[in-house]
Amino acid sequence: YDFTNCDFQKIEADYLRTISKDLITYMSGTKSTDFNNTVSCSNRPHCLTEIQSLTFNPTPRCASLAKEMFARKTKATLALWCPGYSETQINATQAMKKARKSKVTTNKCLEQVSQLLGLWRRFIRTLLKKQ
């Protein structure tokens, strides 16, 4: 999906109002220094591409982020403010609903969410630079 036509201001507002809180809740008990940020992004669409990938694409050591509250809110936000996004995500949504309801938070998932927080912060910064 090409994130170029998204309403970035609205996405930022949703992130600051609600998604960030859920990400921080997920990370509670860990220190910001526990993980190194290895994933970066260069502009707003690129940041959203990376955020989409880390949030919804299962990895071998962290397969279950898509059903977390922050992920559901991220998907809702992208559906609202990125025209055409929903249509490209039908299969991902179905896979998310089929995902098992295990609540195991592995260290690898914590690391991935730490990367997500970094990407979101980068997204906000690139937004500020443009204004």
Epitope: D7, K10, D14, R17, T18, I19, R72, K73, K75, A76, T77, A79, L80, W81, P83, G84, S86, E87, Q89, T93
Partner: antibody, heavy 120, light 111 residues
Framework: QVQLVQSGAEVKKPGSSVKVSCKAS????????INWVRQAPGQGLEWLGV????????IYAEKFQGRVTITADTSTSTAYMELSSLRSEDTAVYYC?????????????WGQGTLVTVSS | QSALTQPPSASGSPGQSVTISCTGT?????????VSWYQQHPGKAPKLMIY???KRPSGVPDRFSGSKSGNTASLTVSGLQAEDEADYYC???????????FGGGTKLTVL
């Protein structure tokens, strides 16, 4: 079962406000969009706005900006639509309608409608 | 945002096919594959018949089909039945600030 149940008919004076409720049951209220659509007697459908409780987003049709307020109480699975500065042209049946999850602009479940009559 | 344009009436005999058109602009129908159609019987709430241009919700007969070409969407009802007599409204997404603009409605009469 899966349904939206709206509050009863209202008669209001011009210049006053009306608040219509829409109680959801049988589905996860917060995940969907709750839209409000009205239909004046013998006329077509007109979209007023939507609320997506999951992310706390409300979007209003430009025509109703500043006059309509849509809210939601997730604890009771109830959405509300308040319209202020009523005039006779606001006489209509007001419907709440569920927007599909992540496809909030398709209205797959409707309330029974609430008739609001504005008359002096 | 102007309403979409529909013919006020359409008719057909039982068993026939009828097509209802819905014309918009590049800002709505032409710009997104987010067209839906609603059926409304007198005194009842509307019912979703078609979404995403051509998809049918479960429970809607396959006699109902939707399509789009450019800025015009169409609803076709084949094998008309008496219970198909109703008002039909098209709707289109028109951007992140306008989730639905509707057509004026078409009264379908089964002769």
């Amino acid at each position: 079962q899966v349904q939206l149940v709206q509050s009863g008919a209202e008669v209001k004076k011009p210049g006053s406000s009306v608040k219509v409720s829409c109680k959801a049951s049988g589905f996860t209220f917060g995940s969907y969009g709750i839209n409000w659509v009205r239909q004046a007697p013998g006329q077509g459908l007109e979209w007023l706005g939507v609320i997506v409780p999951l992310v706390g987003v409300t979007i209003y049709a430009e025509k109703f900006q500043g006059r309509v307020t849509i809210t939601a109480d997730t604890s009771t699975s109830t959405a509300y639509m308040e319209l202020s500065s009523l005039r006779s042209e606001d006489t209509a049946v007001y419907y709440c309608a569920r927007g599909q999850e992540y496809f909030y602009w398709y209205f797959d479940l409707w309330g029974q409608g609430t008739l609001v009559t504005v008359s002096s | 945002q102007s309403a979409l344009t529909q013919p006020p009436s359409a008719s057909g005999s039982p068993g026939q096919s009828v097509t209802i058109s819905c014309t918009g602009t590049t800002s709505d129908i032409g710009g997104y594959n987010r067209v839906s159609w609603y059926q409304q019987h007198p005194g009842k709430a509307p019912k979703l018949m078609i979404y995403e241009v051509s998809k049918r919700p479960s429970g809607v007969p396959d006699r109902f089909s939707g399509s789009k070409s450019g800025n015009t969407a169409s609803l076709t009802v084949s094998g008309l039945q008496a219970e198909d007599e109703a008002d039909y409204y098209c709707s289109s997404y028109a951007g992140t600030d306008t989730f639905a603009i509707f057509g004026g409605g078409t009264k379908l009469t089964v002769l």
